[in-house]
Interface confidence: medium
């Protein structure tokens, strides 16, 4: 008799999830010498232990502590790039500007990027059919709690000038409900972080407005200032060109017109 399985509103665990996590771990530790000591089997075991046999709406940050411990990593605290709703450009940027790091450039962020996972209460099975949706089902699901945990730790580690890339094409350039707005902003340490500099990425080629004047940016500035951290904002026009000009300053499209 087939066992009854909870149907959630979100997509199920990513196909070949265990193999993907293990393979990513091996690849990351090969590329990053400072993480060569990491035992990827132990990492997978700790990852699995955080959600397997647990109700997928009852996951806590504590569940991820063994994984956090194994994935402890030091990145230059003054070279951190946060992002909100503009992940691809942020990742392209750190591929070009190799001394800056997004969360997904760290081991734990790299392991989980774009993946979904959940288990079932009291069984060792991974649920490949469906997983809880943050809005429709529950917020304390394995994926959301993971990103909340690693995002908090990443923000806590930041120092000096922290940059955040924001999507100027969205109606809410700064969204209080995003991971950046709800977790990272509130976990920057005022005693370590001097300035948060927002880079507002313009969408349209001819969009020359000052998006740093946007009401949601003013809201971000207010939140940050109340935390005794200075705030700065830059308009970044033509994001394709921004990347190119950081990567290759001699390129003719950079040395010339906007």
């Amino acid at each position: 008799v087939p066992r009854w399985r909870q149907q959630w509103s979100g997509p199920g665990t990513t196909k070949r999830f265990p193999e993907t996590v293990l393979a990513r771990c091996v690849k990351y530790t090969e590329i990053h010498p400072e993480m060569r000591h990491v035992d990827c089997q132990s990492v997978w075991d700790a990852f699995k232990g955080a959600f397997i046999s647990k109700h997928p709406c009852n996951i806590t940050e504590e569940d991820y502590q063994p994984l956090m411990k194994l994935g402890t990593q030091t990145v230059p605290c003054n070279k951190i790039l946060l992002w909100s709703r503009i992940k691809d450009l942020a990742h392209q940027f750190t591929q070009v500007q190799r001394d800056m790091f997004t969360l997904e450039d760290t081991l734990l962020g790299y392991l989980a990027d774009d993946l979904t996972w959940c288990g079932e209460f009291n069984t060792s099975k991974i649920n490949y059919q469906s997983c809880p949706d943050w809005r429709k089902d529950c917020s304390n699901n394995p994926v959301s709690v993971f990103w909340k945990t690693v995002s908090r730790r990443f923000a806590e580690a930041a120092c000096d000038v922290v940059h955040v890339m924001l999507n100027g094409s969205r109606s809410k350039i700064f969204d209080k409900n995003s991971t950046f707005g709800s977790v990272e902003v509130h976990n920057l340490q005022p005693e370590k972080v001097q300035t948060l500099e927002a880079w507002v990425i313009h969408g349209g080629r001819e969009d020359s407005r000052d998006l740093c004047q946007d009401p949601t940016i003013k809201e971000l500035e207010s939140i940050i200032s109340k935390r005794n951290i200075q705030f700065s904002c830059k308009n970044i026009y033509r994001p394709d060109k921004f990347l190119q000009c950081v990567k290759n300053p001699e390129d003719s499209s950079c040395t010339s017109e906007i």
């Epitope: 020359s208 407005r209 000052d210 740093c212 004047q213 700065s232 904002c233 830059k234 308009n235 033509r238 060109k241 921004f242 000009c245 300053p249 001699e250 390129d251 003719s252 950079c254 040395t255 010339s256 017109e257 906007i258």
Partner: antibody, heavy 119, light 107 residues
Framework: QVQLVESGGGLVQPGGSLRLSCAAS????????MSWVRQAPGKGLEWVSN????????YYADSVKGRFTISRDNSKNTLYLQMNSLRAEDTAVYYC????????????WGQGTLVTVSS | DIELTQPPSVSVAPGQTARISCSGD??????ASWYQQKPGQAPVLVIY???DRPSGIPERFSGSNSGNTATLTISGTQAEDEADYYC??????????FGGGTKLTVL
């Protein structure tokens, strides 16, 4: 080495015309945006005009719009500024500069050529 | 157009820190540059993209830019730093704008 040399300055009467040239060497002129910046005697710097590397875009300060024309000849590695309907207030040292377009700064400057508009 | 305002003059004793301000409506939303000009010479770029230094410019030159003020800081000012300094930025139309200039005197 990277060098910009301006020429064509001199004394001209109000309402007259003058064409300034700027000869570039030591870098790939055809790949760079260029600017003219001027400085009246004892005064500060004033941006005059920019031109993109393909001449497809030109920008002018309000004070010279309609009277000055910036152009370039990439085959001759030369930047030009055609100045018409000159006024006394156009009297200045005119500098040509290589500008970095995306982040908007001028990283190489010529030594300047003096334009005097007087009757 | 954005207007950039600089103090006409700043004085500093040798070895001390000189700070030259450049104020403009939301200048911090755009990138600022600084130029040094000595008498009878062409300007020289000393800071670009707010706080980057061209090669050959001493480490004592640094910059910052936030809100309505960009600042050029010269730590351990030397006699040879005596010059006029100009800030420069651009507005949303991408026109260049220069500040009025500041005469730095090393006492």
């Amino acid at each position: 080495q990277v060098q910009l040399v301006e020429s064509g300055g001199g004394l001209v009467q109000p309402g007259g015309s003058l064409r300034l040239s700027c000869a570039a060497s030591g870098f790939t002129f055809s790949s760079n945006g260029m600017s003219w910046v001027r400085q009246a005697p004892g005064k500060g710097l004033e941006w005059v005009s920019n031109i993109s590397y393909l001449s497809s875009s030109t920008y002018y300060a309000d004070s010279v719009k309609g009277r000055f024309t910036i152009s370039r000849d990439n085959s001759k590695n030369t930047l030009y500024l055609q100045m018409n309907s000159l006024r006394a207030e156009d009297t200045a040292v005119y500098y040509c500069a290589r500008f970095y377009g995306y982040f908007n700064y001028a990283d190489v400057w010529g030594q300047g050529t003096l334009v005097t508009v007087s009757s | 157009d954005i207007e950039l305002t600089q103090p006409p003059s700043v004085s500093v004793a040798p070895g001390q820190t000189a700070r030259i301000s450049c104020s403009g409506d939301n200048i911090g939303h755009y990138y600022a540059s600084w130029y040094q000009q000595k008498p009878g010479q062409a300007p020289v770029l000393v800071i670009y993209r707010d706080n980057d230094r061209p090669s050959g410019i001493p480490e004592r030159f640094s910059g910052s830019n936030s809100g309505n003020t960009a600042t050029l800081t010269i730590s351990g000012t030397q006699a040879e730093d005596e010059a006029d300094y100009y800030c420069q930025s651009y507005d949303y139309l991408h026109d260049f704008v220069f500040g009025g200039g500041t005469k730095l005197t090393v006492l």
